[in-house]
């Protein structure tokens, strides 16, 4: 997704001569190349732009379909419940909403990558804000779920169930409010900008370099490091409790715990490592050179795609690892009169009809 104005060094004549001789695109320079004035090589965008043009539209289209179907199914299963949702289920519903809203913007970014931004500045601001709101919301809601389970299992404190039902809603509202706050720069600085170098219009940030670096640091800390630390801390303690109590159900639950954290970490760590490299280059801690700049651009595209896959991964995890989710899904299909499911009219074997499919208790962790 193109969300930031790219920047290039001002070429001097030695570099233009190299460009005219047509070898600059395949030329690689040493890692310790100095970034003194204009002696660094030209960094043609051709490769990374062509890569984006080919790779991103296909990936975004696939993720759009998978994310919409998967998260739609999760929302449908949760909303089809006749009883009140548990705290974890409420967070999961909000997570499904966040992931759905995020994938809804992907077709726009696919068009932006393939051709140009044709939707105007208004939609650019909305789509950019929506994208980042839900990027942050996804991570923070996962942190909330882990904290809820941590209190639930480690401290045997059912914070949200024992308190007023509004407490979980307030927590979710606080998360959305915080995400809206994080997305303010999008509303202010995003616009459809005609790039005369590329002779195309793109939805891009339009603010000073300092702001750009600050926003990336915020994204790295608030959207990844903080939620990951919360998840790691909470789930490490949950694992400790489950390991002490042993038992097959708990061991199965332990596997699920690991899957949740690992999925988030695997999907988002590569992207944030690339962002970290870019931040270090922005701050001058890492020297810029053509090879590195080109590799970072391509790596950003690949790893961000991997990150967005996380939106589609949650429903798959519930479906393949969460027994209760599958059962609820079958029940929903039966209720909708799905012809292929008529022979499957059996009661769920491992849970009461009104139990939460993601519920976590000290005795049982069949969550997700």
């Amino acid at each position: 997704m193109v969300l930031e104005v790219s920047d290039h060094q001002v070429l001097n004549d030695a570099e233009v001569a190299a460009l005219l001789e047509n070898f600059s695109s395949s030329y690689d320079y040493g890692e310790n190349e100095s970034d003194s004035c204009c002696t660094s090589p030209p960094c043609p965008q051709d490769f990374s732009l062509n890569f984006d043009r080919a790779f991103l539209p296909a990936l975004y289209s696939l993720l759009f379909l998978l994310g919409l179907l998967g998260n739609g199914a999760v929302a449908a299963v949760l909303l089809s419940r006749r009883t009140a949702l548990s705290s974890t289920d409420t967070f999961l519903l909000h997570l499904a909403v966040a992931d759905t809203l995020l994938v809804l913007t992907l077709p726009l970014w696919a068009v932006d990558a393939a051709v140009q931004w044709v939707f105007g500045s208004g939609l650019c601001k909305v789509a950019g804000a929506l994208f980042n709101i839900n990027f942050y919301a996804g991570a923070l809601l996962l942190a909330c779920i882990s904290f809820d389970r941590y209190l639930n299992i480690v401290h045997a404190t059912q914070l949200y169930r024992r308190g007023p039902p509004a407490r979980v809603t307030l927590t979710c509202l606080a998360v959305w409010g915080l995400c809206l706050l994080f997305a303010l720069p999008d509303f202010i600085f995003l616009s459809a900008h005609h790039d005369e170098r590329l002779n195309a219009t793109h939805c891009q940030y339009n603010f000073p370099q300092v702001g750009r670096t600050a926003l990336r640091v915020l994204q790295l800390v608030a959207g990844f490091l903080l939620p990951l630390l919360v998840m790691a801390y909470c789930y490490a303690h949950i694992l400790a409790v489950l390991l002490v109590s042993r038992g097959q159900r708990r061991l199965r639950a332990m596997r699920l715990v690991v899957v949740v954290v690992v999925a988030f970490a695997l999907c988002w760590t590569p992207y944030h490592l690339v962002v970290l490299v870019d931040i270090l280059m922005d701050l001058g801690a890492l020297a810029r050179n053509c090879g590195r700049e080109s590799r970072v651009d391509v790596a950003k595209s690949v790893t961000s795609g991997l990150g967005y896959m996380h939106c589609c991964l949650n429903p798959l995890l519930y479906a393949f690892v969460g027994v209760k989710f599958r059962e609820r899904m079958w029940m929903l299909l039966l209720r909708l009169g799905c012809p292929n499911q008529r022979g499957l009219q059996r009661q769920p074997s491992s849970s009461r009809r009104d139990s939460s499919w993601s519920e976590t208790s000290e005795a049982s962790y069949s969550g997700l």
Partner: antibody, heavy 123, light 106 residues
Framework: EVQLLESGGGLVQPGGSLRLSCAAS????????MSWVRQAPGKGLEWVAT????????YYPDSVKGRFTISRDNAKNTLYLQMNSLRAEDTAVYYC????????????????WGQGTLVTVSS | DIQLTQSPSFLSASVGDRVTITCRAS?????LYWYQQKPGKAPKLWIY???TLASGVPSRFSGSGSGNEYTLTISSLQPEDFATYYC?????????FGQGTKLEIK
């Protein structure tokens, strides 16, 4: 029509500071690298500073490095030059100049210039 | 630093004359650029990439050269050509200008 309008010049004492601005119009400011070039009274031209189109890269000659800072606000289509520790030899007309686009990147000559703003450093 | 030395510094000529201004570089440069400046005005790009005329520059102007020596030639001097001409290199930092050649009416 491309227009560059400098402002902020004036009389300043040695050791003092001054901030010059250059308001750009008639072109997509965010697509172009920009520079400041100065001309001492009755003398030739001297390159002072350059900034890349996104503001990530800045370049200076040794004569001003550490004293002058070039920056830009792409939202306001404005280029700045913050001048600190001014010396008598910094007295000049300061021009804001645009770099043309070349082959997807930038070339170092200047295709458009502003009318200039006079900075006088004197006690 | 690459020093650019223009010669002559002053040149008196008449309308219709053929005029050549030379710019010598202390080290080899890839390209040379020429600017025209009239009194009290900002410089204007005149010739870029050694020989390419900027938009609106009459065809009587031409540029040539390579390495250390470059020239700007006016085949038939016109009244509007009287001005100061500066050469500039952008091969290595700092990006320097020549001291200028002032073209005056004889």
């Amino acid at each position: 029509e491309v227009q560059l309008l400098e402002s902020g010049g004036g009389l300043v004492q040695p050791g003092g500071s001054l901030r010059l601005s250059c308001a750009a119009s008639g072109f997509t400011f965010t697509s172009y690298a920009m520079s400041w070039v100065r001309q001492a009274p009755g003398k030739g031209l001297e390159w002072v500073a350059t900034i890349s189109h996104g503001g990530r890269y800045t370049y200076y000659p040794d004569s001003v490095k550490g004293r002058f800072t070039i920056s830009r606000d792409n939202a306001k289509n404005t280029l700045y030059l913050q001048m600190n520790s001014l010396r008598a030899e910094d007295t000049a007309v300061y021009y804001c100049a645009r770099h043309p686009i070349y082959s997807g990147n930038y070339q170092g000559y200047f295709d458009y210039w502003g009318q200039g703003t006079l900075v006088t450093v004197s006690s | 630093d690459i020093q650019l030395t223009q010669s002559p510094s002053f040149l008196s000529a008449s309308v219709g004359d053929r005029v050549t201004i030379t710019c010598r570089a202390s080290s080899g440069v890839n390209y040379l650029y020429w600017y025209q400046q009239k009194p009290g005005k900002a410089p204007k790009l005149w010739i870029y990439f050694t020989s390419t005329l900027a938009s609106g520059v009459p065809s009587r102007f031409s540029g040539s050269g390579s390495g250390n020596e470059y020239t700007l030639t006016i085949s038939s001097l016109q009244p509007e050509d009287f001005a100061t001409y500066y050469c500039q290199q952008f091969t290595s930092s700092p990006y320097t200008f020549g001291q200028g050649t002032k073209l005056e009416i004889k």
